[in-house]
Interface confidence: medium
């Protein structure tokens, strides 16, 4: 879920990201291994780079709560929201939210994390729902096997008209 | 820079009213539920009262409620807190707070504003 | 309501120690602990919270650990400026609870 309308844009290219707390049934050096990955989808066919902090503020902020936590978007307890994320141009730009009482993975049990942290992060990058079923973007879960999954070419356009493509590394 | 500014307090007599204002300045404030939080003299911290973004609902703890009216205008950036029926026990220093998005914790205070309630 | 219990309730300590409070939740609340230093006349500042999340600005030798129902806060090398009061707070469930205190004096 994006929480604030408009088209928007982060006006840097380097992001900073911080992953604040864990929820109960990953171990966190999973969760970061997921958060990564996220981001990366994202660097891999744009000009961003993201680089993890530890302490003190970040960009993107990814945290996990339960029920209300202050934000005037609660959750509801398993199934039903897994996240929300707040635009670019919010008065909360990069909060990215995950409900605590998902049974979040690695895998194909529960929740994959991933999964649903690339679509939170779009929001983030600035990125509504998408129509498209085989978008990321897509407002309903889906689950793609993470080895192999790859964004839809909407993703990928959309993503681009926010930031430009990837700048090539070949010189000739 | 990130403010929040109370006004208000003073010596008031039981059975009295006073009206607490707190101004925010620096961040999105029609965002944030608000908080007023107090703190008798020489004791600990005590939640008041909480109110949503939007202003529909209002929390209250059990020592103040039919008393206290929490309210805000977004467009003031002003939280407010109306006491009435006020009590000796209500003698306090008032907190405004808001709760952080990524931290769900009182990230900002107001300087708090005192509110003496005697004869 | 959840009661937050804080021990101990004041301390004597000289620059440089380590300096360890804890507190009790009446019942599990996950990392939903935060812990703020307030000083004489001043409102409280947050240090820690999600029980071990270092606040930005805050120093380093402020940590915070603990799940469930017990935590902790430490200070590595206590300094003239961390001589206050903290406080442990709980964001489980609402309303929200503080501990009632604990007060570091110099020795």
């Known amino acids: 879920t994006s929480i604030s309308p408009g088209r928007c844009k982060w006006n840097k290219h380097t992001l900073t990201y911080r992953i604040i707390n864990y929820p109960h049934d990953m171990k966190p050096s999973a969760v970061k291994d997921s958060i990564y990955n996220a981001v990366s989808i994202w660097s891999n066919v744009t000009p961003l780079i993201f680089q993890q902090v530890q302490n003190g503020d970040a960009d993107i902020k990814v945290s996990f709560w339960q029920w209300a936590h202050e934000d005037g978007w609660p959750f509801d307890g398993p199934g039903g929201i897994l996240g929300h994320a707040f635009l670019p141009n919010s008065g909360n730009p990069g909060v990215v939210h995950f409900d605590k009482n998902e049974h979040w993975s690695a895998s194909d049990t529960g929740y994959n994390l991933f999964l649903v942290a690339t679509h939170e992060i779009g929001h983030s990058l600035g990125l509504q729902h998408s129509g498209n079923q085989s978008s990321i973007m897509y407002p309903t879960y889906w689950y793609h096997d993470p080895r192999t999954f790859q964004l839809s070419a909407d993703d990928i356009q959309r993503i681009q008209h926010l930031y430009g493509e990837k700048c090539s590394s070949d010189i000739p | 820079e990130v403010q929040l500014l109370e006004s208000g307090g003073g010596l008031v007599q039981p059975g009295g009213s006073l009206r607490l204002s707190c101004a925010a300045s620096g961040f999105t404030f029609s965002f944030y539920a608000m908080w007023w939080v107090r703190q008798a003299p020489g004791k600990g911290l005590e939640w008041v009262s909480r109110i949503y973004s939007s202003g529909g609902k209002t929390w209250y703890a059990d020592s103040v409620k039919g008393r206290f009216t929490i309210s805000r205008d977004n467009s003031k950036n002003t939280l407010y807190l109306q006491m009435n029926s006020l009590r000796a026990e209500d003698t306090a220093v008032y907190y405004c707070?808001?709760?952080?998005?990524?931290?769900?914790?009182?990230?900002?205070w107001g300087q708090g504003t005192m509110v003496t309630v005697s004869s | 309501d959840i009661q937050m219990t804080q021990s101990p309730s004041s301390l004597s300590a000289s620059v440089g120690d380590r300096v360890t409070i804890t507190c009790r939740a009446s019942?599990?609340?996950?990392?939903?602990l935060n812990w703020y230093q307030q000083k004489p006349g001043k409102a409280p500042d947050l240090l820690i919270y999600a029980a071990s999340s270092l606040q930005s600005g805050v120093p380093s030798r402020f940590s915070g650990s603990g799940s469930g129902t017990d935590f902790t806060l430490t200070v590595s090398s206590l300094q003239p400026e961390d001589f206050a009061t903290y406080f442990c707070?709980?964001?489980?469930?609402?309303?929200?609870?503080f501990g009632g205190g604990t007060k570091v004096e110099i020795t």
């Open positions: 707070a808001r709760v952080g998005m990524s931290t769900y914790a009182f990230d900002i």
């Open positions: 707070q709980q964001s489980y469930s609402i309303p929200l609870t």
């Open positions: 019942q599990s609340i996950s990392d939903y």
